[in-house]
Interface confidence: low
């Protein structure tokens, strides 16, 4: 029988021989994980833990910030002899188990990544039923995430009212992107309508399009720019897009 | 610095009550754990009772279960232990303490402990 | 609910290493933490999980834990190290914490 433990970023410290039980409660984590905003991450977290064949009730938590105390970004409970874990929060949509608990993986995939997701991660198992035991992350895992470059991810020219058109722009990038419509008119620029944003994602709408030709969207932050152009031809009353 | 700031100590009748503050600075305290541990003279540390950062789980040891509540402000950075009923051998420097790190945690920082006397 | 048994005395000639043992049923299995207390004051954790030291903490203070005794080792004792010492774990059957009864170091 084996006991180990393990330091702060994963490395094993020990084993000895030892009595019952064969494992005691560890967690594995990797000291660091590295995404782009826009993109998504994995938080990998394993355990071991010294109840035998443990097959009742659990729970898994992430939380952030802080271990045992700071506030949760995830949890799931899994029926006695499920390998299901039902996500009960899941802060805004965007955290979802990777792993499967019951093969002592917590692992969590995090969407949609915004610089303010850096921080720590910690990850803790409870088992609620006649073990009734629990123990979490330590150290946690440090998610880091990088500024992204602009890049417009559309550009559209749709139907507005009275027979008008409307550009739609829309951009990604973190920090979020300033953005800019130009165009044929006078002065060859236009007032766009800055849109909310969504997370690490833009929209500016140019709200009337007055004349034919060329319309372009700008995205702007601190790591560069993109843009991208639309044309609009007005043959027959129908827009044409090019891009 | 971490700091927490214990008052309410005192000499109180058998039977009486009296209510414990830690005023808790230097940290985010509704992010934590807290807990009341306490040492009788001459005797060693007794734990007493926790509550979560949120104040939804609270523990007691069975000497003082029904008679003591743990009880917390996060808007004013102060937990509380109110001790009813008291008797003799509840006698004892009480400390406050903050949990540090998982759940099997221990206690990383103390208060400066308040004498708490019994007698009639 | 745990029961953790400290010797109550340990003496050691300054220099020397001093280990102070907890005893406990299966306490291996356990995360042990260990404070000093010294006449008057509030006590200090010196190891926790076992093995690790807060910061501030000499290098001279270590710990380990297996089977049913966890140990808290002072290499090097210096006299400033004289000081009553608690191991403490966490009762996952009654979510209480426990603490040993203490041992109260004497440099000799």
């Known amino acids: 029988l084996v006991k180990t433990r393990r330091d702060a970023s994963g490395d094993l410290l020990n084993t000895e021989a030892h009595s019952a039980p064969a494992q005691r409660w560890s967690m594995q984590v990797p000291a660091e994980v590295n995404a782009e905003a826009g993109d998504a991450a994995v938080l990998p977290c394993t355990f071991t833990h010294p109840h035998r064949h443990y097959d009742g009730p659990l729970t898994a938590i992430w939380r952030s910030g802080e271990p045992y105390a700071g506030p949760q970004v995830f949890r799931c409970t899994a029926a006695p002899g499920s390998e299901l874990c039902q996500t009960a929060l899941s802060l805004h949509g965007r955290f979802r188990l990777l792993g499967n608990p019951r093969r002592n993986d917590l692992s969590l995939r995090v969407e949609r990544l915004a610089l303010a997701d850096s921080g720590r991660y910690f990850c803790r198992v409870e088992f609620t039923g006649d073990a009734h035991d629990r123990y979490e992350s330590r150290h946690g895992v440090r998610l880091r995430v990088t500024a992204a470059a602009p890049r417009i991810v559309n550009i559209s020219v749709l139907p507005g009212p009275a027979h008008a058109f409307r550009a739609l722009c829309t951009a990604e990038g973190e920090p979020p992107p300033a953005l800019a419509w130009s165009g044929p008119a006078p002065g060859n620029s236009s007032a766009a309508l800055q849109g909310q944003g969504h997370g690490y994602q833009v929209t500016a709408e140019l709200p009337a399009l007055t004349r034919d030709g060329r319309y372009t969207c700008t995205a702007a932050n601190s790591l560069g720019r993109a843009e991208a152009s639309v044309y609009l031809f007005r043959f027959h009353g129908a827009p044409g897009t090019s891009t | 610095q971490v700091q927490l700031v214990q008052s309410g100590g005192g000499v109180v009748q058998p039977g009486r009550s009296l209510r414990l503050s830690c005023a808790a600075s230097g940290f985010t305290f509704s992010s934590y754990a807290m807990h009341w541990v306490r040492q009788a003279p001459g005797k060693g540390l007794e734990w007493v009772a926790v509550?979560?950062?949120?104040?939804?789980?609270?523990y007691y040891a069975d000497s003082v279960k029904g008679r003591f509540t743990i009880s917390r402000d996060n808007s004013k950075n102060t937990l509380y232990l109110q001790m009813n009923s008291l008797r003799a051998e509840d006698t004892a420097v009480y400390y406050c303490?903050?949990?540090?790190?998982?759940?099997?945690?221990?206690?990383?920082?103390w208060g400066q402990g308040t004498l708490v006397t019994v007698s009639s | 609910q745990s029961v953790l048994t400290q010797p109550p005395s340990v003496s050691v000639a300054p220099g020397k290493t001093a280990r102070i043992t907890c005893g406990g049923n299966?306490?291996?299995?356990?995360?042990v933490h260990w404070y000093q207390q010294k006449p008057g004051q509030a006590p200090v954790l010196v190891i926790y999980d076992d093995s690790d030291r807060p910061s501030g903490i000499p290098e001279r203070f270590s710990g380990s834990n297996s089977g049913n005794t966890a140990t808290l080792t002072i290499s090097r004792v210096e006299a400033g190290d004289e000081a009553d010492y608690y191991c403490q774990v966490w009762d996952s059957s009654s979510d209480h914490r426990v603490f040993g009864g203490g041992t109260k170091l004497t440099v000799l």
């Open positions: 299966n306490i291996g299995s356990k995360s």
């Open positions: 303490a903050r949990e540090g790190g998982s759940y099997y945690g221990y206690f990383d920082y």
């Open positions: 509550i979560s950062y949120d104040g939804s789980n609270k």
